[in-house]
């Protein structure tokens, strides 16, 4: 990561392409992540997105990218960050201190209209997606699948 401090931070609610909300609930001293329809006027959970600039030549990164990328971390509550658990293909909330581990960083994609996608830094080609009303890690095989709705999310200040 180029620089240890984010270039900007943004507090937003996160929803799916189909306008379901991503919510976070404290259960048995740990957080669970849900994808659900909210009732009208129900308050949406907010996530702090911290954006980092990453720069490397493609021969270093191994991902074919030869310039800048935007990395993002997502924190719904103080000291907790979304983590990619590549072994379990799951997305989890972990409490941790900075510097954050690579599993907490996601490459931001926003080349699809006004939606964003989050690709695992630790596992290129694997994205945060929606599966059975939960967030999961989803392997995207072909270029056309980058536009598949279950890995597209919307950010909103409201």
């Amino acid at each position: 990561i180029t620089g240890i401090s984010p270039i900007t931070e943004y507090l937003a609610s996160l929803s799916t392409y189909n306008d379901q909300s991503i919510t976070f609930a404290l259960e048995d001293e740990s957080y669970e992540i849900y994808v659900e329809d909210l009732k009208k006027d129900e308050k949406k959970d907010k996530v702090l997105l911290s954006y980092y600039e990453s720069q490397h030549p493609s021969n270093e990164s191994g991902d074919g990218v030869d310039g800048k990328m935007l990395m993002v971390t997502l924190s719904p509550t103080k000291d907790f960050w979304l983590h990619a658990n590549n072994k379990e293909h799951s997305v989890e909330l972990h409490k941790c201190e900075k510097p954050l581990p690579d599993q907490a960083f996601f490459v931001l994609h926003n080349m699809h209209s006004n939606c964003v996608s989050f690709e695992c830094k630790t596992d290129p080609g694997v994205f945060i997606g929606v599966k059975d009303n939960h967030l999961a890690l989803i392997k995207v095989d072909s270029s056309e699948n980058l536009c598949t709705e279950n890995i597209l999310f919307k950010l909103s200040e409201t």
Epitope: T8, Y51, V65, G67, V107, M111, H112, S143, L146
Partner: antibody
Framework: QVQLVQSGAEVKKPGASVKVSCKAS????????MHWVRQAPGQGLEWMGE????????SYAQKFKGRVTMTRDTSTSTVYMELSSLRSEDTAVYYC???????????????WGRGTLVTVSS | DIQMTQSPSSVSASVGDRVTITCRAS??????LAWYQQKPGKAPKLLIY???RLQSGVPSRFSGSGSGTDFTLTISSLQPEDFATYYC?????????FGGGTKVEIK
């Protein structure tokens, strides 16, 4: 080196179509969106739309929907912008332009073609 | 669509002057704002991105600030090669939109 090479100037009659090409080199073509921006003589910059070379999906400015088509050929790292039903007010320099960050337009546009002048005149 | 309003539309200044250009977005765009310099017959050149980050190779006399809806480009000491037209651009949502431009002319 990293560059965008555009096709040459065109003169078209009202009602005709024009297709401008933009060949990318020196970087991973499918990792960056490609934008089209135009500039009428003595006027400001106007964003027309973007194509995602990875999957071919497009986003067009409302003003151009129905008249503009952006396509790409990954085998030659070339994008195309076709504008139909041309009118005199479409006379402009058309730029293809690449964002400075892979996969994202948030960090601005740092690589520009030299521009293609399209003149619409009867 | 997000409207970007730039002011002034033109400014006359001398070499060594401090020049400030402002840009206002019709709605919040976080820090996703870029500034470009354009000279006649040339393509735009990226100066500043993410509101305040200096693009590689751009002289440090250029600086940017702001977030939300109000942004500023400052040239701390105008040089002869800085006489050009400057544009802001919101990079937050499609359609991307540009300000109307500010022409910096020799006094």
């Amino acid at each position: 080196q990293v560059q965008l090479v555009q096709s040459g100037a065109e003169v078209k009659k009202p009602g005709a179509s024009v297709k401008v090409s933009c060949k990318a080199s020196g970087y991973t073509f499918i990792s960056y969106g490609m934008h089209w921006v135009r500039q009428a003589p003595g006027q400001g910059l106007e964003w027309m739309g973007e194509i995602n070379p990875h999957g071919g999906s497009t986003s067009y400015a409302q003003k151009f929907k129905g008249r503009v088509t952006m396509t790409r050929d990954t085998s030659t790292s070339t994008v195309y912008m076709e504008l139909s039903s041309l009118r005199s007010e479409d006379t402009a320099v058309y730029y293809c332009a690449r964002p400075s960050a892979a996969y994202s337009h948030y960090l601005g546009i740092d690589l520009w073609g030299r521009g293609t002048l399209v003149t619409v005149s009867s | 669509d997000i409207q970007m309003t730039q002011s002034p539309s033109s400014v006359s200044a001398s070499v060594g002057d401090r020049v400030t250009i402002t840009c206002r977005a019709s709605q919040g765009i976080s820090s996703w704002l870029a500034w470009y310099q354009q000279k006649p017959g040339k393509a735009p050149k990226l100066l500043i991105y993410a509101a305040s980050r200096l693009q590689s190779g751009v002289p440090s006399r250029f600086s940017g600030s702001g977030s939300g809806t109000d942004f500023t480009l400052t040239i701390s000491s105008l040089q002869p090669e800085d006489f050009a037209t400057y544009y802001c651009q919101q990079a937050n949502v499609f359609p991307l939109t540009f300000g109307g431009g500010t022409k910096v002319e020799i006094k």
